[in-house]
Interface confidence: low
Amino acid sequence: AKLGAVYTEGGFVEGVNKKLSLLGGDSVDIFKGIPFATAKTLENPQRHPGWQGTLKATNFKKRCLQATITQDNTYGQEDCLYLNIWVPQGRKQVSHNLPVMVWIYGGAFLMGSGQGANFLKNYLYDGEEIATRGNVIVVTFNYRVGPLGFLSTGDANLPGNFGLRDQHMAIAWVKRNIAAFGGDPDNITIFGESAGAASVSLQTLSPYNKGLIRRAISQSGMALSPWAIQKNPLFWAKTIAKKVGCPTEDTGKMAACLKITDPRALTLAYKLPVKKQEYPVVHYLAFIPVIDGDFIPDDPINLYNNTADIDYIAGINNMDGHLFATIDVPAVDKTKQTVTEEDFYRLVSGHTVAKGLKGAQATFDIYTESWAQDPSQENMKKTVVAFETDVLFLIPTEIALAQHKAHAKSAKTYSYLFSHPSRMPIYPKWMGADHADDLQYVFGKPFATPLGYRPQDRAVSKAMIAYWTNFARSGDPNMGNSPVPTHWYPYTLENGNYLDITKTITSASMKEHLREKFLKFWAVTFEVLPTVTGDQDTLTPPEDDSEVAPDPPSDDSQVVPVPPTDDSVEAQMPATIGF
C-alpha cells in the first residue's frame, strides 16, 4: 500500500514509496522537505502560506544557516523551516492511526539539521529504520540555531527563543496534519538528543504546547541542564552587536540593527572556543534558550505542572561528559599526558562558581575520595569524565525525573543509562558511551549499514528501537509491537529505577539509585552552601583569535573528515557534536 498525494493545510504533497524488499509487500512512504513555517531574521516563525498544485517532497532541504565545523564559513540558508516524514506501510491497506515520533536534533543550539550528518546519502537521522521496525511515523525537521535562533536582548526588543518557537511550529503542524499521513494526532511523542533533548524538555514545559504532546524522550539533556538556559543574554547580544557594528547602549536600536545585518555576518560573529579557556567550554554556549516570560514563562524548575500528563523517558550516556572533558582537560584522552589535581580543581572551580571556594572544595573532596586508594592516571581521568557527566547531564536529568514523577498525574516516568561503549578506536580502553554515541543505535544504523557494525551493536539498536517505539505507542516501553529483552520498570522517587542499556540486556539491567552518593551531594550538601555570585557574572568571551573547533572524533561509518564548502551540497556534520 502507498499514500500517493496527501492533502495538507498547505496543499497536496507527494513523496516516494520505497519498497522494503524486492518481492513487494511492506514499504515506507517518505516525504522530504515539506514547509511548516516561514520566518524573517530574528523574528518569530509564522504559518507557511501554502502552495498551489502538488509539492514534490522528495529531497531534503538545506539546513538552517550555521557556521561550518571550522567556524570560518557558513552553510545552509535562512529559508529552512521544512520537515520530513516516514510512514511505514503494509502490503494491503494504508496505515492509519499510527503513533507519531517527532525528532529534535542536537548540536549545542548552534548546529545541526533534521536529516543529520550524511555520508554518501546515508543520513544519520533517516527515520526509516525506526518507522519500519517500530511501525510508527517518524518526523524530523529543521529549526534555527546559533545567533539566528537564540540571540536575545533579554527584553521585548529581541526576546529570543526563535529556534524553540520553530520547534513548536513543527509540532503544531504535525498535530494539525499528521492524520492525513496515517498518524494519530493524539499520540505524538517528541524525542531528541543533547540540545534536542533539552528542547524536548522545554517544549513539554512550555504552555504553548498544551495538549499537543502525549509523550517525550530526552536523551542526554534537560531544561534543567546548566547549558540549556542563558541567564545573561544581553551580555552575549552586545558581544555580537559590537562585532557587526551595531549600537549596544539601547536594546531597541541594537535589535533593529541586528535584524537588518547580513545573517551570515551574525552567524560568523560568534565562535565557540575549543581551546582550553578560563571556564569550562559549556559556559561559552552563548546562544541558547532564555526565560522570556512567554514561551518559557518561568524558570523550568517551576513549570513541571505542565508535564503532569506527558509520559517521559529520560536518560544519559554513562560517559556523556567525555566530549567536554577532552576540551576542558585535554590530557584526559592522551595516554602520555597526566591529569593533575590542579587540573581537576580548576575544572571543578569553573563549574561551581556560584558557590565560591566552599563549593569548589566540597566538590573536589567528594570526587577525589577514591584517589587515596587508587591514584592511577586511569582513575583520575575517569573522575574528570564522571564529574563532567554528573554536572552536565546526570544531576539535571535526575532532578528532572524526580520533578516529573512528583508532578505526574496520568504520566509515567522511565529512566535509562546508555552504557554500550564507544566504537572509536582512538579512545582509551576504559571508555564508555560518549556524548551522542546513542544516536546511531536509536536510528538503526547497525541495520542500515550492517558492514560497519557488529552483532552486539545490532542487539543494542534493536532493543532501543523496540523500547522507544513501544513507549511511543503505549506510554510503556514494554508494551507495543516489539518484543523487548527485559521488562523496563518505571522510575520511582524511592528507588531511582533505571534501565542500563548494554549489549546484553537482562533482568539485572534493571538497576536503581544511579550514583546516589553524588546525587545526594549535589542535591543536599552543595545546594545548601551559600551562593556567592551569579553563574556568569565574571565570564569574559574568548578573544577573536581563539582557536575554532576542530573536527572532533566521530563515528567513522557516518562521517567524512572535511565538510564540503559548496553550499549546494548537504554538508557533513560529525555525529559526536550532538550537544
Epitope: H487, L493, E494, S507, A508
Partner: antibody, heavy 119, light 105 residues
Framework: QVQLVQSGAEVKKPGASVKVSCKAS????????MHWVRQAPGQGLEWIGV????????SYAQKFQGRVTMTRDTSTSTVYMELSSLRSEDTAVYYC????????????WGQGTLVTVSS | DIQMTQSPSSLSASVGDRVTITCRAS?????LNWYQQKPGKAPKLLIY???RLPSGVPSRFSGSGSGTDFTLTISSLQPEDFATYYC????????FGQGTKLEIK
C-alpha cells in the same frame, strides 16, 4: 514501613462474587503496582493479575479474564479484587502483593484472605 | 504461558547442609525470583533478578542462572530455613513453579 492489610475471611456460595480489599500504608501508593496471587489449600501460588494504582490500568492472567476485576481507591490507598461466578475450585487464600523494585518481584505481601466457596 | 518446573518437589536435609533447588522455564526468560513460604504465612521474597538479595535476606542464600535454567542455593542450612520455596518468572503473565518443600531429615 510498608504494610498491606487485607479484609477478613469470606464464605461464598457457588455463582456468587467476592470482593477482597488490600489497604496499603508506609509508601507512596501510586508508585508501585499491586498484584493479586492466590493459593488453594495445599497447592502452589497462582498469579491472578496486576493493577497500576496510578492510573488504574490492569492486566489479568488469561485464566481469570472476564471473571476478575481489580480497582483502586487512591483516596484511601486501597486496592480491590473482585472475582465473580465463584466455583468450589476458587477456594483459596488470596494475597495482595506489592512490587519491590529493580526486577520488580513481589516484595511485600498482605497477610492473606481466605475465601471459601461452598454450597 | 511460560511453565516453570522445580526440582525436586521435596527434599530432606540437615542443619548445616548445602542445598540446591533448580527451576527450569519452558522458554527463555529474563527475570527469575525466588520466594520462601512457611505454613500459614504469606510468601517472602528471597532472591530477585536471578541472583540479587533484598535487604535483610541472609547471605547464605544465593541464586544463579539465566535463560531457562536457574538455581537457588542455601550454603549452610539453618533451622529457620525449613519451608517451601517457589520460583517465579516475571513477564506480562507471571507464573510460579509448583514449589519445593524443604524438610528436616
Amino acid at each position: 514501613q510498608v504494610q498491606l492489610v487485607q479484609s477478613g475471611a469470606e464464605v461464598k456460595k457457588p455463582g456468587a462474587s467476592v470482593k477482597v480489599s488490600c489497604k496499603a500504608s508506609g509508601y507512596t501508593f501510586t508508585s508501585y503496582n499491586m498484584h493479586w496471587v492466590r493459593q488453594a489449600p495445599g497447592q502452589g501460588l497462582e498469579w491472578i493479575g496486576v493493577i497500576n494504582p496510578s492510573d488504574g490500568a490492569t492486566s489479568y492472567a488469561q485464566k481469570f479474564q472476564g471473571r476478575v476485576t481489580m480497582t483502586r481507591d487512591t483516596s484511601t490507598s486501597t486496592v480491590y479484587m473482585e472475582l465473580s461466578s465463584l466455583r468450589s475450585e476458587d477456594t483459596a487464600v488470596y494475597y495482595c502483593a506489592r512490587d519491590y523494585y529493580g526486577s520488580s518481584p513481589l516484595g511485600y505481601w498482605g497477610q492473606g484472605t481466605l475465601v471459601t466457596v461452598s454450597s | 504461558d511460560i511453565q516453570m518446573t522445580q526440582s525436586p518437589s521435596s527434599l530432606s536435609a540437615s542443619v548445616g547442609d548445602r542445598v540446591t533447588i533448580t527451576c527450569r522455564a519452558s522458554s527463555s526468560i529474563s527475570y527469575l525470583n525466588w520466594y520462601q513460604q512457611k505454613p500459614g504465612k504469606a510468601p517472602k521474597l528471597l532472591i530477585y533478578a536471578a541472583s540479587r538479595l533484598p535487604s535483610g535476606v541472609p547471605s547464605r542464600f544465593s541464586g544463579s542462572g539465566s535463560g531457562t535454567d536457574f538455581t537457588l542455593t542455601i550454603s549452610s542450612l539453618q533451622p529457620e530455613d525449613f519451608a517451601t520455596y517457589y520460583c517465579q518468572q516475571r513477564s506480562s503473565s507471571p507464573t510460579f513453579g509448583q514449589g519445593t518443600k524443604l524438610e528436616i531429615k
